[in-house]
C-alpha cells in the first residue's frame, strides 16, 4: 500500500495545534502508531515522543479509498521552551513500516511572536503571539 505522513499547524487564539496526518487505506490502519517528536533528529520513537496515537481500523468506514488519521498536539501558550525542531512519524512494528515526516521548527522571537517554518503542507506559517493572527 501507499501510506504517507504530512505535518501541518493551526492557530486558535493563543493555542497552537501541531497536526500529524497519516494517509492510508482502511485496512492499513491497524498496527500503526503515529507520534510527534521534538529535538530528536536521530531517535524519534513512540517512547521518546511528545504524544502518540495508535490507529485502529474503523469498521464504520466503507470502501477502500484513502482515509486520514490525525494526531493533534496542542500548545496552549507558546513560550521560548517550545522553540525547537519537530517531526511527525509513524511506524508499524507488525509490518516493518516506518514513516518519517519532514522536520519543521518553532522559533520564538524576542518580540514575543513565533514562527513555524518547514511545513510542506502549508509552506511557511507565521503566527503573531500578541495579535493572535496567522500571517
Amino acid at each position: 500500500g501507499c501510506i504517507n505522513i504530512t505535518s501541518s499547524a493551526s492557530q486558535e487564539g493563543t493555542r497552537l495545534n501541531l497536526i500529524c496526518t497519516v494517509w492510508h487505506k482502511k485496512e492499513e490502519a491497524e498496527g500503526f502508531v503515529v507520534f510527534l517528536c521534538k529535538d530528536r533528529s536521530g531517535d524519534c520513537s513512540p517512547e521518546t515522543s511528545l504524544k502518540q496515537l495508535r490507529l485502529k481500523r474503523d469498521p464504520g468506514i466503507d470502501g477502500v479509498g484513502e482515509i486520514s488519521s490525525q494526531l493533534m498536539f496542542t500548545i496552549s501558550q507558546v513560550t521560548p521552551l517550545h522553540s525547537g525542531t519537530y517531526q511527525c512519524c509513524a511506524r508499524s512494528q507488525k509490518s516493518g513500516i516506518r514513516l518519517q515526516g519532514h522536520f519543521f521548527s518553532i522559533l520564538f522571537t524576542e518580540t514575543g511572536n513565533y514562527t513555524v517554518t518547514g511545513l510542506k503542507q502549508r509552506q511557511h506559517l507565521e503566527f503573531s503571539h500578541n495579535e493572535g493572527t496567522l500571517s
Epitope: 500500500g1 491497524e30 498496527g31 517512547e47 495508535r54 511506524r91 508499524s92 512494528q93 507488525k94 509490518s95 516493518g96 513500516i97 516506518r98 514513516l99 518519517q100
Partner: antibody
Framework: QVNLQESGPGLVQPSETLSLTCTVS????????INWFRQPPGKGLEWMGT???????DYNSALKSRLTISRDTSKSQVFLKMNSLQTEDTAIYFC??????WGQGASVTVSS | DIRMTQSPASLSASLGETVSIECLAS??????LAWYQQKPGKSPQLLIY???SLQDGVPSRFSGSGSGTQYSLKINSLESEDAATYFC?????????FGSGTKLEIK
C-alpha cells in the same frame, strides 16, 4: 504470495563471521521491513534486529557491536552479518516481514 | 530490557476444551503484545497482535486479552492441530522480547 527464504553456510568456525541472506518475493522491501530472529536448539526466540522499509536499522543492544543488517532492494534481498561467532550462536535464524510472515529458517552451527 | 514471564511452561488438554496461557511483562507494555504458534521444525505463525487483534486467516477460536502488564491467550474448542508451542512477544520497547513458551499437548 508473500515468501521469505533464508540461506547461509550451515557451519561456521568459532570467531568467524556469519553471513545470511533473506530473499523475499510477493512484496517490495521499500514497502515493508524485515526482522531477524534466532532460536537456539530447544530454546526460546530472540529478536536480533530490524531493517525498516526506508532502510533504517534497529538492533538488539546485546548484539549491536557485532551485527550488521543491510539490503539490496533491486534483488529483494536482506543480509545479516554477525562477527566473532561463538558456540552459543548456534541457532536457527529466521527472517520475517515485520512480525507477520516468517521464512522457514536457516540452521547455523558454530563449531570447529 | 522488558522481561516476559510466560506460564504455564506446558499443559495438556482434551479435544474441545478451552485453555488459557498467560504472559506477564516486567513493566507496562501498553497492549503491544503478539502471540505466536510454533510447531516442531516450522517457523512461528502470528496469531494475535496488539493484545487482542486476530491476524487474518487465524481461526476465531483463538483470542487475546489483557492490558498493562498482564496478557492472556485463550483457545476455545481445542482441535488436534492446536498442539504446538505458543510464545508471546512484546513490541512496546527495544529490544523486542519473547516469553519462554508454552507447550500445549492434546490428549
Amino acid at each position: 504470495q508473500v515468501n521469505l527464504q533464508e540461506s547461509g553456510p550451515g557451519l561456521v568456525q568459532p570467531s568467524e563471521t556469519l553471513s545470511l541472506t533473506c530473499t523475499v518475493s510477493g512484496f517490495s522491501l521499500t514497502n515493508y521491513g524485515i526482522n531477524w530472529f534466532r532460536q537456539p536448539p530447544g530454546k526460546g526466540l530472540e529478536w536480533m534486529g530490524t531493517i525498516w522499509n526506508d532502510g533504517g536499522t534497529d538492533y538488539n543492544s546485546a548484539l549491536k557491536s557485532r551485527l550488521t543488517i543491510s539490503r539490496d532492494t533491486s534483488k529483494s534481498q536482506v543480509f545479516l552479518k554477525m562477527n566473532s561467532l561463538q558456540t552459543e550462536d548456534t541457532a536457527i535464524y529466521f527472517c520475517a516481514r515485520g512480525m507477520e510472515a516468517w521464512g522457514q529458517g536457516a540452521s547455523v552451527t558454530v563449531s570447529s | 530490557d522488558i522481561r516476559m514471564t510466560q506460564s504455564p511452561a506446558s499443559l495438556s488438554a482434551s479435544l474441545g476444551e478451552t485453555v488459557s496461557i498467560e504472559c506477564l511483562a516486567s513493566e507496562d507494555i501498553y497492549k503491544n503484545l503478539a502471540w505466536y504458534q510454533q510447531k516442531p521444525g516450522k517457523s512461528p505463525q502470528l496469531l494475535i497482535y496488539y493484545a487482542s487483534s486476530l491476524q487474518d486467516g487465524v481461526p476465531s477460536r483463538f483470542s487475546g486479552s489483557g492490558s498493562g502488564t498482564q496478557y492472556s491467550l485463550k483457545i476455545n474448542s481445542l482441535e488436534s492441530e492446536d498442539a504446538a508451542t505458543y510464545f508471546c512477544l512484546q513490541d512496546s520497547e527495544y529490544p523486542l522480547t519473547f516469553g519462554s513458551g508454552t507447550k500445549l499437548e492434546i490428549k
